[in-house]
Interface confidence: low
């Protein structure tokens, strides 16, 4: 390609400008440029677009349907980490905040029409996790931090006065209403990055035009890490039906029994009064908000394929390198999906010794090439061992039994689960499946921790101990609906004390 020489660049300074080649002149044809922002641990990347004008198809149906020129934004290394979004036309992408450590942009142009291009600025902000942080922050529906482009719906009422973008909690102009009131309809929020979801606040709405009130009395919750594989949130074996509003104005807060790790959230109304009208806030936090909980590179691609290995593998498509959390659509499958407990393992070499404080485990899809049936597999229980040199291994122990700790795994092939433990010094981490789904062993993984210098384990924590509870951060534990009037915040604000 003629225009691509020297148009790719890595950015490591605390702030900077990223522009299409030649900006402010029109960009050249036939470009494939990669811009990568690399942040040190504890730094959040904030990316803001100032100008954006790329060629687009006038017949383009939805956002992301870009045929000619486009900008892809990746959570991590391009084509390894998850795609955050594909952008073209003149609609400026909204502000992005990434705590993964790597944010990449790939810019593609074709041989024809050229436009003015884009100019963006980024800056890195120090994020010091609080030891006693509370995972109950409003995620941004009310404040606007969740941008309009992140909110969508199955349909919208035909008069254009009840759009998904009007579904913000305490929004003063109607709310979201589908074209037809039905329990097949949903409101969807893309949180862009993997996020802990701990609670949902809902309101109905009063029509500005008619003064009639509408509200959702109950709803189901669906979550997905990729926007394609969805899981309905369950209570036990049954789909959980959340009790919602009793009038059009009061806010009702539903706390989840346990935090859900997700990117996409769907609210699916089940019953309603007069008609469906919904305003919404989501509460939670990022995985990295907890101390020493950086994603160490499986998702982002910072950990190379060569650093991921396994006891065995089924075939290339489901090799260890496919075991990246979320970013892989498949996952790792061992050679024999139904192996003996403890026989198979997936290993990550972190490159240098780190302080490791947890893993995120996810199921996998694919795997059964004999029957051509797509297996949806996950690990129900697992053990973790670790090593500093790759030779001497220790299991994380259960302090009550002094035996290797048996961690709870997944209940679904797409929804990830975090399992935290006391800090361990490790360069190598192995996960041993012990029990698994009927479809066999299938796994994707991320390792959580921080640099060895950030959090040197004390003498006590160097031993193979683990807290008895697997999630040590103070998430809401009870599942309940609370009416909370004008303002829905978690009342316990002791998470941030003045010095």
């Amino acid at each position: 390609k003629t225009g691509s020489e020297d148009c790719s660049k890595n950015f490591t300074s605390p702030n900077g400008t990223i522009e299409s080649p030649g900006f402010p002149e029109k960009y050249p044809h036939n470009l494939d440029c990669t811009f990568t922002i690399l942040a040190k641990p504890k730094m959040e990347i904030i990316l803001q677009f100032l100008i954006f004008d790329l060629e687009h198809d006038p017949l383009q149906v939805g956002e992301g349907d870009c045929k000619y020129d486009w900008l892809d934004i990746w959570d991590g290394i391009p084509h390894v980490g998850p795609l955050i979004g594909k952008y073209c036309g003149t609609k400026t992408p909204s502000e992005l905040r990434s705590s993964t450590g790597i944010l990449s942009l790939t810019f593609h142009t074709d041989m024809a029409v050229a436009k003015d291009g884009f100019s963006a600025r980024y800056y890195l902000v120090h994020q010091e996790p609080l030891e006693n942080f509370q995972c109950n922050v409003p995620l941004g529906m009310e404040s606007g931090r969740i941008a309009n482009e992140q909110i969508s719906a199955s349909s919208t009422y035909s008069d254009g006065r009840w759009t998904p973008q009007q579904s913000r909690l305490h929004g003063d102009d109607n709310g979201w209403t589908p074209n037809l009131d039905s329990n097949k309809e949903y409101l969807q929020v893309d949180l862009r990055f993997l996020t802990m979801l701990t609670a949902i606040a809902t309101q109905g709405a009063i029509s500005r035009e008619t003064q009639n009130g509408y509200y959702v009395k109950s709803y189901k919750l669906e979550v997905s890490t990729n926007g394609e594989d969805w899981m309905v949130y369950r209570h036990g074996k049954n789909h959980k039906v959340f009790q919602a509003n009793n009038d059009a104005t009061e806010v009702v807060l539903n706390k989840l029994h346990a935090p859900l790790l997700t990117r996409f959230v769907r609210i699916r109304p089940q019953t309603w009064h007069s008609g469906i009208a919904l305003r919404l806030e989501l509460f939670g936090c990022r995985v990295t908000d907890a101390p020493c909980s950086n994603m160490l590179g499986m998702l982002s691609g910072l950990i190379a394929d060569s650093q991921i290995s396994a006891s065995s593998t089924q075939e290339y498509l489901w090799s260890p390198s496919a075991a990246r959390l979320v970013s892989s659509r498949s996952g790792w499958f061992p050679r024999i999906p139904q192996a003996q407990p403890g026989e198979e393992w997936l290993q990550v070499d972190l490159g240098t010794p780190k302080t490791v404080k947890g893993v995120i485990i996810q199921g996998a899809r694919g795997g059964d090439s004999i029957t051509a049936v797509e297996a949806r597999a996950f690990v129900r229980k697992f053990k973790v061992s670790y090593s500093l040199n790759g030779k001497d291994w220790e299991y994380i122990q259960d302090p009550r039994t002094q035996q290797p700790k048996l961690f709870e795994g997944n209940m679904h092939y797409d929804t990830p689960d975090i399992r935290r433990f006391d800090p361990i010094p490790a360069q190598y981490v192995r996960v041993y499946p012990e029990r698994w789904s009927p479809a066999g062993i299938g796994m994707r993984l991320e390792v959580l921790g921080c640099d060895w210098t950030d959090s040197k384990p004390t003498v006590e924590t160097l031993g193979p101990t683990v807290k008895s509870e697997e999630t040590t951060t103070p998430y809401p534990t009870e599942e309940e609906a609370t009416e909370c009037g004008e303002n829905c915040s978690f009342e316990d604000d002791k998470d941030l004390q003045l010095p």
Epitope: E128, D172, N487, S489, D493
Partner: antibody, heavy 121, light 108 residues
Framework: EVQLVQSGAEVKKPGATVKISCKVS????????IHWVQQAPGKGLEWMGR????????KYAPKFQGRVTITADTSTDTAYMELSSLRSEDTAVYYC??????????????WGQGTLVTVSS | DIQMTQSPSSLSASVGDRVTITCTAS???????LHWYQQKPGKAPKLLIY???NLASGVPSRFSGSGSGTDFTLTISSLQPEDFATYYC?????????FGGGTKVEIK
């Protein structure tokens, strides 16, 4: 201990420019936003603007936009507020203030002692 | 801009009295972004309460805050001599941040 120490009182003629300093200690100025607040005699508090020192990015209240410039010098851990085209109604005490770390756009936990600017012909 | 209206603008009270100051926002403010300051003559304001109801470090427990949406309250349960001052509410929910006009608490 966090401290913000401001420069001394100033007397200026209408049309002139005043530049007030705010030296911080006890923390790294780059980690904070530095805000400036005006208080006219016998009146309430009015936010003028702020600087994100690390990014050298400023935001100003519409009322002061065009007349106020906030800057910072990281080598001396000092922030500055310059107000130009002074008029008599600018006679006030000016405070620098900063939120607690980690709450950049929240409450002002620390304040300077204030600088009285008198505009008189 | 969000206007913050305090009432009363001044009040006279005696030591031991219970004092309530209200602050009304022109549009809804999340309780995480509503704060109170105390200012004594010739001094800089001092943070009293943050996030509607959390006492700043060193603030006596006779001070308390409450409210949500557009209506917020600062209460002094038993007024002490050192509490005679001017009190300001402050929102930083929407930019620009704004302050109430102040409530001067004087000795009766």
């Amino acid at each position: 201990e966090v401290q913000l120490v401001q420069s001394g009182a100033e007397v200026k003629k209408p049309g002139a420019t005043v530049k007030i300093s705010c030296k911080v200690s006890g923390f790294n100025i780059k980690d904070y936003y530095i805000h400036w607040v005006q208080q006219a005699p016998g009146k309430g508090l009015e936010w003028m603007g702020r600087i994100d020192v690390e990014d050298d990015e400023t935001k100003y209240a519409p009322k002061f936009q065009g007349r106020v410039t906030i800057t910072a010098d990281t080598s001396t851990d000092t922030a500055y507020m310059e107000l130009s085209s002074l008029r008599s109604e600018d006679t006030a005490v000016y405070y620098c203030a900063t939120p607690i770390y980690g709450s950049r756009e929240a409450w002002f936990a620390y304040w300077g002692q204030g600088t009285l600017v008198t505009v008189s012909s | 801009d969000i206007q913050m209206t305090q009432s009363p603008s001044s009040l006279s009270a005696s030591v031991g009295d219970r004092v309530t100051i209200t602050c009304t926002a022109s549009s809804s403010v999340s309780s995480s972004y509503l704060h109170w300051y105390q200012q004594k003559p010739g001094k800089a304001p001092k943070l009293l309460i943050y996030r509607t109801s959390n006492l700043a470090s060193g603030v006596p427990s006779r001070f308390s805050g409450s409210g949500s949406g557009t209506d917020f309250t600062l209460t002094i349960s038993s007024l002490q001599p050192e509490d005679f001052a001017t009190y300001y509410c402050h929102q930083y929910y929407r930019s620009p941040p704004t302050f109430g006009g102040g409530t001067k608490v004087e000795i009766k």
